[in-house]
Amino acid sequence: CRTSECCFQDPPYPDADSGSASGPRDLRCYRISSDRYECSWQYEGPTAGVSHFLRCCLSSGRCCYFAAGSATRLQFSDQAGVSVLYTVTLWVESWARNQTEKSPEVTLQLYNSVKYEPPLGDIKVSKLAGQLRMEWETPDNQVGAEVQFRHRTPSSPWKLGDCGPQDDDTESCLCPLEMNVAQEFQLRRRQLGSQGSSWSKWSSPVCVPPENPPQPQVRFSVEQLGQDGRRRLTLKEQPTQLELPEGCQGLAPGTEVTYRLQLHMLSCPCKAKATRTLHLGKMPYLSGAAYNVAVISSNQFGPGLNQTWHIPADTHTEPVALNISVGTNGTTMYWPARAQSMTYCIEWQPVGQDGGLATCSLTAPQDPDPAGMATYSWSRESGAMGQEKCYYITIFASAHPEKLTLWSTVLSTYHFGGNASAAGTPHHVSVKNHSLDSVSVDWAPSLLSTCPGVLKEYVVRCRDEDSKQVSEHPVQPTETQVTLSGLRAGVAYTVQVRADTAWLRGVWSQPQRFSIEVQVSD
C-alpha cells in the first residue's frame, strides 16, 4: 500500500486489545481544503515506541488503515480511497508494547465536516436567576453549532454538560453556579446537524468564583496614638485564599475576591464625610476617634457577607493642653495649633452619657495666631457646654477634612461647663474640734471633682474675726479635709472653702463660724 492511500488489508499488527484507560483519544477529522482532509488525535501515556494507525470503515463495510507512525496528525486527499461524500467511521488504533489501544470512534461525512473552533477570545460571565450565563462571539464562518461544557471544582472531577444548539452570531450557555466553591469551565463546539462531526478542542479555562464570596476571617489591632495624633490600624490575620480548581491556579482571572475596608468615623458627626472605602492591602492611619470597620468581600457577582468591628475611641487625655477663658461675651478655647490652614472639629459630650449624644462644631480652616494657638469661641446663647456638668472634649484636626483617613486627634480633655466657679463651690463644710488649738475642716467633694483633671486644688480660708487676719491653705484635689492649727481659744473664726480650676478661681462657700472653747481648769 502507498503511504498516501488508505490500505485495504488487515492491519500489520496482531489483535491484542489492551483495554487500558490510556491510549489515543479526542479524534477529530475535517476537511481543510476543497480536496484535502485531516485527522488529529491525542495520545495519553508513554509515547516511546508507539505506532498509530488511523482506521476507517466505509458504508460498504470495507475497512482500511493509514499508518501514521509516531505522528498524531494525518492528512489525506479525496483520492486516498476513503469516500468523503458518504458516512464513514474512523478511529485510531495505537500499537505499543505488544498491545493495541483504541480511540472512541467518530462517524461522519468527511466532505461536510468543518473544523470547528472552541469559543475564542473573551467569554463573558454573568449571573442569571441563580445560574451562570456564559456568552461569546461565534467564531468566523461557524454559525450553527452544538456546544458542550465541562466543569470541575477543586475537589471534584470533570462533569459534562450540554449548552444546546446555537444558531447566531453570539452563542451562550447556562451552567450551574456553585454557592461556595470556585469552578473551572471549558467549552467546545461542533457543527450543528452534521451527525458524528468532530468536537473542537476545549476552550481555555473560564474560572468562575462561587456565588457567595468567602466571608473574610480577619483580625485587626490598633496601635497606640502617636505624637501626631494618629494610630495605625494593622491586619493581624490575612483573609483566607479561595481554593481553586487545577486549571485556575496561578493566573485565574474571574475568581478574584477583592476585600475592601469600609471605615466609618463615629466621632465628630458634623464633618462632611463619615465613611471611606479602601483596599484591604492599604492599611490606614486613624485618629483617636471611635470607628466602625467593616471588611467587605466581593467578586464579579457582587458583594458577599461582611465582618464588622468596633474600634473604641482613644481616651488618653492631655493634662493642660487646652486653655479655656470664660468672658461676658462667651467662652473661648485655645490649644496649640497643628499647622497652617487646618480645619478643627471640636466634639463634646456629657460624661457618663451615651456616645450618641456627642455634639460637635467644625471650624473654618484657620492659621495659628501669633502665639501659635488655634481658637474656638462660642456665645452663652449658643447653649454649647452650657449645663453645669462635666464634658469630655476631643479636638480633631485635618488639612483635608473631606478625607476621612487624614484626621488626627489634637487633644482629649475634660471641661466643666456652665458657671463652673459657682457650680464647683464645695458644700456641707463642717468644723470639728481636733485639739486645744486646732480644728478639722471637712467638706463634700466639689462637682468639679467628677471631671478628671479639671479640679486643680481646694483652698481653705480661715479668718480671725478679732484681728481680721486671714490665712489660706491649699488642699490637694483628692482631699476633702484639712486641719487648721495654731488657733486661740475663745476667738471667733470663720472658715470658707473654694474649688479652683487651672484657669478659673472658684467661689467661696458660705462662711462657717466656729471658736475653740476656753478650757477651765479645776
Epitope: 485495504f8 486489545d17 483495554g19 482506521r55 472512541p104 470512534e105 467518530v106 462517524t107
Partner: nanobody, 125 residues
C-alpha cells in the same frame, strides 16, 4: 475475551417478528464491534448485521436490509437484532459475535474472535 449469551430465538410464522438479544460479560463491551451471523443446516455461516462501537454505523447483508435492525446498549452490555417480516429462508441458528479489531471487512467472520453458542430461529411458511 468476552463471553456472549444469545436469547430470544424461537418458532414464528412467516411475516412475524422476533427480537434477539446478546448479553456480553467480561472485558469492556464498548470496545468491540458487534455482529450477528447465521448458519442454516448444511450451509456456511453467513454475515447478517454488524454495529460499530459507537452504535452509529450499522451494516446489513443485502438479504436482510430493510427488515432487520441491529442496535446496542453499551450501558447494558447488550446487542439486539430486531427481525421483522420474517421469511422461511431466515430459518437458522443465529450467532452473536464480537470483534476487538476489524480487518479488511466488517462482514468477514475472521475478524470476530468471540462467539456465542447460538439461538435457533425457525420460520414456518
Amino acid at each position: 475475551q468476552v463471553q456472549l449469551v444469545e436469547s430470544g430465538g424461537g418458532l414464528v410464522q412467516a411475516g412475524g417478528s422476533l427480537r434477539l438479544s446478546c448479553a456480553a460479560s467480561g472485558r469492556t463491551f464498548s470496545s468491540y464491534v458487534m455482529g450477528w451471523f447465521r448458519q442454516a443446516p448444511g450451509q456456511e455461516r453467513e454475515f447478517v448485521a454488524a454495529i460499530m462501537r459507537n452504535g452509529i454505523m450499522t451494516y446489513y447483508a443485502d438479504s436482510v436490509k430493510g427488515r432487520f435492525t441491529i442496535s446496542r446498549d453499551n450501558a447494558k452490555n447488550t446487542v439486539y437484532l430486531q427481525m421483522n417480516t420474517l421469511k422461511p429462508d431466515d430459518t437458522a441458528v443465529y450467532y452473536c459475535a464480537a470483534a476487538s479489531r476489524v480487518g479488511v471487512s466488517i462482514s468477514q467472520s475472521s475478524s470476530y474472535t468471540s462467539w456465542g453458542q447460538g439461538t435457533q430461529v425457525t420460520v414456518e411458511p
